[in-house]
Interface confidence: low
C-alpha cells in the first residue's frame, strides 16, 4: 500500500494491476479504438471524465519529485470510474452480456485505489456522481465514451507505474 | 470573457418551489461546468450544487440533497436550479459562477475560489 508523505507505493503490484486494468478496458469494448462517434455535444460529454494532464506530476521528473501528487490524480481518476462502472450507466437496460469483463474491470479498479490509498490517511474524493440517463440508447452511448476514455486514461496510469516499478522501486 | 445572468427567483411560501436560471454568454459557454451557490445575510457564501460540462456530474450540498435539481441546456447555454419543499434556511442571494475548467475530481468543486465567472445573483426569500 502507499503511505503519506512522500513514501513509494507497491510500484510493482500497481504495475501488473495497471496492466490486467488495460487488458480488462480493451477486452470490455474493444471496437472502442476502431469507432470514433463524433455526434453533437461529444466534446462536452468526454470533458467530464479525467484525464492525466500536464502538471499533475505524472511525468518522470514529477515522479521523482513527489509521487503524491500524481497517485493523488490516478486515485482520483480510479474512484471515479469505480463509480461510474457500478452505476446506472452499466447496471441498467440494457443488461450487459453475463460474460462482460465489465464487472472485473469494476473489481480491478477498486482493487488499484485501494493499493494507493494511504495507510490511515483518506485522500478526499468526491460525493457519487449523479447519472440518470432516461432512455437505454443513451446509457449505451456513455457507456461507450466512458470505456474509451477509461482506456486511455489506464494506458497513461500503466505507463505510470511501470516506469515506478523500474526506476523508483526501493 | 463569460457573462453570466441569474434570474427565477423572488418571494415564495415556505414548502413551495422556484426554479432559478442561469444564462450564459459571451465565449463558447456550452461546457462550461457550472456550480451554484448561496449567500445569506451575515453568512459566508455556501455551496448549492454543481454540474460538469456535458451534464454527466451533478453533485448537491447535504442540505440540499432531495430537494434542489441542478440540469442544464447546452443549446440555450443556460443552467437551472429547480428548487422544491423551501423553507426559510433557503433564503440567501443565489449566484451561478463557472470555473474555466471542469472540476470533476476532488474536492474543488464546493470552493467559491475554484470558480473565475460569477453572476449578479437572485434573491430567493422563503417566508414561513
Known amino acids: 500500500r502507499a503511505v503519506p508523505g512522500g513514501s513509494s507505493p507497491a510500484w510493482t503490484q500497481c504495475q501488473q494491476l495497471s496492466q490486467k486494468l488495460c487488458t480488462l478496458a480493451w477486452s470490455a469494448h474493444p471496437l472502442v479504438g476502431h469507432m470514433d462517434l463524433r455526434e453533437e455535444g461529444d466534446e462536452e460529454t468526454t470533458n467530464d471524465v479525467p484525464h492525466i494532464q500536464c502538471g499533475d506530476g505524472c511525468d518522470p521528473q514529477g515522479l521523482r519529485d513527489n509521487s503524491q501528487f500524481c497517485l493523488q490524480r490516478i486515485h482520483q481518476g480510479l474512484i471515479f470510474y469505480e463509480k461510474l462502472l457500478g452505476s446506472d450507466i452499466f447496471t441498467g437496460e440494457p443488461s450487459l452480456l453475463p460474460d462482460s469483463p465489465v464487472g472485473q474491470l469494476h473489481a480491478s479498479l477498486l482493487g488499484l485505489s485501494q493499493l494507493l490509498q494511504p495507510e490511515g490517511h483518506h485522500w478526499e474524493t468526491q460525493q457519487i456522481p449523479s447519472l440518470s440517463p432516461s432512455q437505454p440508447w443513451q446509457r449505451l452511448l456513455l457507456r461507450f465514451k466512458i470505456l474509451r476514455s477509461l482506456q486511455a486514461f489506464v494506458a497513461v496510469a500503466a505507463r505510470v507505474f511501470a516506469h515506478g516499478a523500474a526506476t523508483l522501486s526501493p | 470573457e463569460v457573462q453570466l445572468v441569474e434570474s427565477g427567483g423572488g418571494l415564495v411560501q415556505a414548502g413551495g418551489s422556484l426554479r432559478l436560471s442561469c444564462a450564459a454568454s459571451?465565449?463558447?459557454?456550452?461546457?462550461?461546468?457550472m456550480g451554484w451557490f448561496r449567500q445569506a445575510p451575515g453568512k459566508e457564501r455556501e455551496f448549492v450544487a454543481y454540474i460538469s460540462g456535458g451534464g454527466l456530474t451533478i453533485y448537491y450540498a447535504h442540505s440540499v440533497k432531495g430537494r434542489f435539481t441542478i440540469s442544464r441546456d447546452n443549446a440555450k447555454n443556460t443552467v437551472y436550479l429547480q428548487m422544491n419543499s423551501l423553507n426559510s434556511a433557503d433564503t440567501a442571494v443565489y449566484s451561478c459562477?463557472?470555473?474555466?475548467?471542469?472540476?470533476?475530481?476532488?474536492?474543488?468543486?464546493?470552493?467559491?475560489?475554484?470558480?473565475?465567472?460569477w453572476g449578479q445573483g437572485t434573491q430567493v426569500t422563503v417566508s414561513s
Open positions: 459571451g465565449r463558447t459557454s456550452s461546457s462550461y461546468s
Open positions: 459562477a463557472a470555473p474555466k475548467r471542469d472540476l470533476y475530481l476532488g474536492s474543488r468543486y464546493p470552493v467559491p475560489e475554484s470558480y473565475d465567472y
